[in-house]
């Protein structure tokens, strides 16, 4: 019986000769469990596994812990890939994280972290980041050191309040902190003075809700 080729991430897909952006089936490390992910084969040499996308407000991001764990949405549109898969993947080898942002005035910016991983569920998928470069602010809009992940039904933040309820969406909230790319989607002309919107403070400030965001990861040695 012919052995089926499995891909761990989009870098594997790219290396196999499949260099067209689109949805591919990836396999969890050391497992037969599969997930579908959008592979960006164009940005900066390709091989990027997309772990989050916001673009039009079509998907509700005010989800439960379990939904953020397994992922939701459509990989070709708005989605969250899933904390469990990302945690397992980023603990196998060193990954970089690129966050691409777009505002309502047509400006684009990015933040690139040279080392990114998520702790296991036992440690609430805490985010770990090192080495920030990019155009979306000299200071990290994801609080450092990294925080545990919080959702509407799992309050792991450092605020007396429940940040995920107050600001909506699952995120690595501090108290509540300078970012939330999973906040409420606000259309143009309703996107300012929105403290529960899609926020990246060190690029656009407190009350500005972004038009589009993409979070993607790739092995550091790609």
């Amino acid at each position: 019986k012919e052995e089926q080729i499995t891909f761990r991430d989009c870098a594997d897909v790219f290396r196999s000769g499949l260099t067209t952006s689109g949805i591919y089936t990836l396999t969890f490390p050391n497992s037969t469990e599969e997930t579908k992910a959008y592979c960006d084969m164009e940005t900066g040499g390709g091989g990027w596994t997309t772990i989050q996308r916001r673009e039009d407000g079509s998907v509700d991001f005010q989800r439960t812990w379990k939904e953020y764990k397994v992922g939701f949405g459509n990989p070709s549109g708005e989605h969250w890939l899933g904390n469990e898969f990302v945690s397992q993947l980023t603990n196998q080898q060193r990954y970089v994280l690129k966050i691409h942002l777009r505002d309502w005035e047509g400006n684009e910016a990015y933040s690139l972290y040279e080392h990114f991983y998520l702790s296991s569920e036992e440690f609430n998928y805490r985010i770990h980041l090192k080495g920030l470069t990019g155009t979306a602010g000299k200071i990290s809009s994801i609080s450092q050191p990294g925080n545990d992940f919080s959702t509407k039904d799992a309050d792991n933040d450092k605020c007396i309040c429940k940040c995920s309820q107050m600001l909506t969406g699952g995120w690595w909230f501090d108290a509540c902190g300078p970012s939330n790319l999973n906040g409420m989607y606000y259309p143009q002309r309703q996107n300012t003075n929105k403290f529960n919107g899609i926020k990246w403070y060190y690029w656009k400030g407190s009350g500005y809700s972004l038009k589009a965001t993409t979070m993607m990861i790739r092995p550091a040695d790609f």
């Epitope: 429940k162 300078p178 403070y201």
Partner: antibody, heavy 121, light 107 residues
Framework: QVQLVQSGAEVKKPGASVKVSCKAS????????MVWVRQAPGQGLEWMGY????????GYNQKFEGRVTMTTDTSTSTAYMELRSLRSDDTAVYYC??????????????WGQGTLVTVSS | DIQMTQSPSSVSASVGDRVTITCKAS??????VAWYQQKPGKAPKLLIY???TRDTGVPSRFSGSGSGTDFTLTISSLQPEDFATYYC?????????FGGGTKVEIK
């Protein structure tokens, strides 16, 4: 200690402008948002807007949009609120206040002493 | 804008009395409510934030409770220095708004 000291009382004619200052001390000025709140004689409190001294970002209550401008001078740790086209119902005590957070406009933990602005012909 | 309806608008009480002030929000504000005390000719002073957390230095006789739309400020045993006007404030939604105030007067 943390303190906000505002400029003195003003008397203005209808149609004129007023600029109130608020000098901060005892903390890192760019680490907290500043808000402006006014209180008409014998009335309650009304939020006018905020400014983020870190990046100059502002957000104004729609009621004052187009008439109010909030600015800061980080070199002197001073916030300013200018209100234009004054009317008699703008007669009020104007307060600056610090928010407890840079990233959100939460509650207000430190207040200036207030500046009485009287609009009268 | 979210309306914050405070009641009563005034209350007469004696030293040692228990005083309760309520605030009702026109929509859910979670626990994003603060309470301020204001004395004549003075700036407001923060007492309570996140509905029930006392600010530094605020006496324990002041307590806050509530979530969603209904909030309460309680002064367990009124002291002479507590005669003032009290305001609730929601900061869950833009723009932040205040209640109309409750004047606590000497009976």
């Amino acid at each position: 200690q943390v303190q906000l000291v505002q400029s003195g009382a003003e008397v203005k004619k209808p149609g004129a402008s007023v600029k109130v200052s608020c000098k901060a001390s005892g903390y890192s000025f760019t680490d907290y948002n500043m808000v402006w709140v006014r209180q008409a004689p014998g009335q309650g409190l009304e939020w006018m807007g905020y400014i983020d001294p870190y990046n100059g970002g502002t957000g104004y209550n729609q009621k004052f949009e187009g008439r109010v401008t909030m600015t800061t001078d980080t070199s002197t740790s001073t916030a300013y609120m200018e209100l234009r086209s004054l009317r008699s119902d703008d007669t009020a005590v104007y307060y600056c206040a610090r928010t407890r957070d840079r990233y959100d406009v939460w509650y207000f933990d430190v207040w200036g002493q207030g500046t009485l602005v009287t609009v009268s012909s | 804008d979210i309306q914050m309806t405070q009641s009563p608008s005034s209350v007469s009480a004696s030293v040692g009395d228990r005083v309760t002030i309520t605030c009702k929000a026109s929509q859910d504000v979670y626990i994003a409510v603060a309470w301020y005390q204001q004395k004549p000719g003075k700036a407001p002073k923060l007492l309570i934030y996140w509905a029930s957390t006392r600010d530094t230095g605020v006496p324990s006789r002041f307590s806050g409770s509530g979530s969603g739309t209904d909030f309460t400020l309680t002064i367990s045993s009124l002291q002479p220095e507590d005669f003032a006007t009290y305001y609730c404030h929601q900061y869950s939604s833009y723009p932040p708004t205040f209640g109309g105030g409750t004047k606590v007067e000497i009976k």
